[in-house]
């Protein structure tokens, strides 16, 4: 059985300020069991953008229907993009546990923000 892969197909995405950014992520298996999280940046200072398991993320919505039992698409949309949102976003699969542990990360998608069209 092949090991789960986290696929972020877009190396970079460019969005105009004020628009929404769609960041794509799919996994190739539902196993191992555990949540998906999105982060901006890497390392200990990375910023949590979305946690499938818990939390309130008012600017973030899932693109596909995450309540489908067979769902493997964890793409997100971030609304009202500003220059402060620029950075590299990582889709990360966690393995369930106490606490959950990081299992595999996508390669990252770099978000750049264009000036708002006048």
């Amino acid at each position: 059985e092949e090991e789960l892969q986290v696929i972020q197909p877009d190396k970079s995405v460019s969005v105009a300020a004020g628009e929404s950014a769609i960041l794509h992520c799919t996994v190739t298996s539902l196993i191992p069991v555990g949540p998906i999280q999105w982060f901006r940046g890497a390392g200990p200072a990375r910023e949590l953008i979305y946690n499938q398991k818990e939390g309130h993320f008012p600017r973030v919505t899932t693109v596909s229907e995450s309540t489908k039992r067979e769902n493997m698409d964890f793409s997100i949309s971030i609304s009202n993009i500003t220059p402060a949102d620029a950075g590299t976003y990582y889709c990360v699969k966690f393995r369930k546990g106490s606490p959950d542990t990081e299992f595999k990360s996508g390669a990252g998608t770099e978000l750049s923000v264009r000036a708002k069209p006048s």
């Epitope: 539902l30 191992p32 069991v33 398991k53 229907e65 995450s66 309540t67 489908k68 369930k96 106490s98």
Partner: antibody
Framework: DVQLVESGGAVVRPGETLRLSCTAS????????MSWVRQAPGKGLEWVSG????????YYADSVKGRSTISRDNSKNTLYLRMSSLTAEDTAVYYC???????????WGLGTLVTLSS | ALTQPASVSANPGETVKITCSGG?????YGWYQQKSPGSAPVTLI????KRPSDIPSRFSGSASGSTATLTITGVQAEDEAVYYC???????????FGAGTTLTVL
């Protein structure tokens, strides 16, 4: 407060059809997957059927597959279960339950009783 | 199917552990309390160890491998009930329940 109120339970004859309803309040119904769980007299809990938040995807236990249909009307905050070809084994209290992110249950209704009688 | 003991008993103030096995490592577990047959179940734990905000802190959950455990620390008379473990399996898309454990407080 989350509230789930089932209705539609009745005394019915074997072979008949019945539709149960569950009206939800206190949360954004259209954002949550839902399930039906039943409990026969003197027995334990048995999952019957589940449905994704939009209603596009449905799931059934083998015991009801092919003769039950789960559906929902998000504009009415209502979940349904239509059961046909009823038999004595379908006698139970039927609960609707809200699903968590990983398809367990966090809130339950009070239940509605379906009794088969010839 | 999930396997749990048919009954357990304890004196008030004691700690009770109820185990549930058989779900495999592709499952999450929850625990549901039913105080009388036909009454609405109450979720004590979901996602192995998540306790809803309105549930007393004496209830806790854990999971290791294919076994989940519900722990009641300082059991009270009002905890007399049937406790069901439930699981969701990501390989079958199906929910299952154990047969229930009757807790008697002596």
């Amino acid at each position: 407060d989350v509230q789930l109120v089932e209705s539609g339970g009745a005394v019915v004859r074997p072979g008949e059809t019945l539709r149960l309803s569950c009206t939800a309040s206190g949360f954004t119904f259209s954002s949550y997957a839902m399930s039906w769980v039943r409990q026969a007299p003197g027995k334990g809990l048995e999952w019957v059927s589940g449905i994704s938040a939009s209603g596009s995807d449905t799931y059934y236990a083998d015991s009801v597959k092919g003769r039950s249909t789960i559906s929902r009307d998000n504009s009415k905050n209502t979940l349904y279960l239509r059961m046909s070809s009823l038999t004595a084994e379908d006698t139970a209290v039927y609960y609707c339950a809200r699903e968590t992110w990983n398809h367990l249950f966090d809130y339950w209704g009070l239940g509605t009783l379906v009794t088969l009688s010839s | 199917a999930l396997t749990q003991p048919a009954s357990v008993s304890a004196n008030p103030g004691e700690t009770v552990k109820i185990t549930c096995s058989g779900g495999g490592t592709s499952s999450y577990y929850g625990w549901y309390q039913q105080k009388s047959p036909g009454s609405a179940p109450v979720t004590l734990i979901h996602s192995d160890d998540k306790r809803p905000s309105d549930i007393p802190s004496r209830f806790s959950g854990s999971a290791s491998g294919s076994t989940a455990t519900l722990t009641i620390t300082g059991v009270q008379a009002e905890d007399e009930a049937v406790y069901y473990c439930g699981g969701y399996d990501y390989t079958t898309y199906v929910n299952t329940f154990g047969a229930g454990t009757t807790l008697t407080v002596l």
